[in-house]
């Protein structure tokens, strides 16, 4: 079998809301992946599991199941959203993200994603991780290629 390539493209959008009383930040982060099938047969993308870390702490997890089929020598672009919560021991971030005196409230988040593919009863896992700046001070749409949005997300328990 030839390779299945997974390329993390980046953050497509980040939508933010706050709970002032709990000093909590809620960030819904949509990421974009390119999955390329270099084989001469179709490959099933069984699931995508993702997590987001801030300062070595996992702040959000998500899992997409039964996603799509990628034809021979084809590529698909997939969006997935990870709901994240920055709270408690990270609640000092609330001050920064809501600070009016600065324009861009960039924080550095670690995006981790694992794609599980299947073909002829064989499963393969490919993982990627990348640090990304995300603006926690406003809703932001980042300039990435257009892609289909797969809203079959189930936040992990």
């Amino acid at each position: 079998p030839r390779s299945i390539e997974v390329k993390y493209i980046g953050v497509k959008s980040a939508y933010v809301s706050y709970d002032a009383e709990k000093r909590t930040i809620y960030l819904n982060i949509t990421n974009t992946l390119n999955i390329t099938n270099n084989n001469y047969y179709s490959v099933e993308v069984e699931n995508i599991t993702a997590q987001v870390q801030f300062s070595k702490t996992v702040i959000g997890k998500a899992r997409l199941n039964n996603i799509t089929n990628i034809g021979p020598l084809d590529m698909k672009q997939i969006d997935y959203t990870v709901p994240t919560v920055i709270a408690e021991e990270m609640s000092y971030m609330y001050d920064f993200c809501t600070l009016l005196s600065i324009k861009v409230h960039n924080i550095v988040l670690m995006m981790q994603v694992t794609v599980t593919t299947a073909y002829f009863g064989h499963s393969e896992q490919i993982s990627q991780e990348r640090y990304q700046y995300v603006d926690c001070g406003r809703n932001t749409t980042y300039q990435l290629a257009q892609s289909e949005y797969l809203n079959v997300l189930q936040p992990q328990q």
Partner: antibody, heavy 117, light 107 residues
Framework: QVQLQQPGAEFVRPGASVKLSCKAS????????ITWVKQRPGHGLEWIGD????????NYNESFKRKATLTVDTSSSTAYMHLSSQTSEDSAVYFC??????????WGQGTLVTVSA | DIQMTQSPASLSVSVGETVTITCRVS??????LAWYQQKQEKSPQLLVF???NLADGVPSRFSGSGSGTQFSLKINSLQSEDFGTYYC?????????FGSGTKLEIK
């Protein structure tokens, strides 16, 4: 306004231990990490560790793990640092500070610890 | 541990001149850097947080720039009250180490 109050000086005998205090006021004590920093005369700043009063969780610089113990008393909004087995190398000013994202905006005045027989 | 290399170690500058202090970091810390000013017998004072943002009450002649491994603090039109020692500090991972300091003296 936010204030972190520290005693001006502490004298300690070699081999003994000392407990430094940092009393916070003007904000909700349990919401912010308190960090401790050492400065020896003519030297730079060394990060010792920090503690989150809301949970008691703490982080230490490996260099200070056997020397410093960080605690808090939430009822009095006070952070403490216990320094054991004092030697002349421990003679320094010790600052407490309140953590924010990307910096420490609030500092105590510092406590000068003098280790002397 | 992350190493912070600050330069120069000291400099003597006249009032009205412009000064740039640099901080080189041993690994990519993105924007996780602060700058402080410390005067003799005083606590450090936060000048810049998250690499480029001025702290409350800090005059606009101060500015921070850089990201990744190279950072700088610039002071335009130096005033006599700007003397003291300047430190950078990273916030990427514990321990949050400081630079060795730059002593700024007014000519």
């Amino acid at each position: 306004q936010v204030q972190l109050q520290q005693p001006g000086a502490e004298f300690v005998r070699p081999g003994a231990s000392v407990k430094l205090s940092c009393k916070a006021s003007g904000y909700t004590f349990t919401n912010y990490w308190i960090t401790w920093v050492k400065q020896r005369p003519g030297h730079g700043l060394e990060w010792i560790g920090d503690i989150y009063p809301g949970s008691g969780n703490s982080n230490y610089n490996e260099s200070f793990k056997r020397k410093a113990t960080l605690t808090v008393d939430t009822s009095s909004s006070t952070a403490y640092m216990h320094l054991s087995s004092q030697t002349s190398e421990d003679s320094a000013v010790y600052f407490c500070a309140r953590k924010a994202y990307g910096g420490f905006p609030y500092w105590g005045q510092g406590t000068l610890v003098t280790v002397s027989a | 541990d992350i190493q912070m290399t600050q330069s120069p170690a000291s400099l003597s500058v006249s009032v009205g001149e412009t000064v740039t202090i640099t901080c080189r970091v041993s690994e990519n810390i993105y924007n996780n850097l602060a700058w402080y000013q410390q005067k003799q017998e005083k606590s450090p004072q936060l000048l810049v947080f998250a690499a480029t943002n001025l702290a409350d009450g800090v005059p606009s002649r101060f500015s921070g720039s850089g990201s990744g491994t190279q950072f700088s603090l610039k002071i335009n039109s130096l005033q006599s009250e700007d003397f003291g020692t300047y430190y950078c500090q990273h916030f990427w991972d514990t321990p949050f180490t400081f630079g060795s300091g730059t002593k700024l003296e007014i000519k």
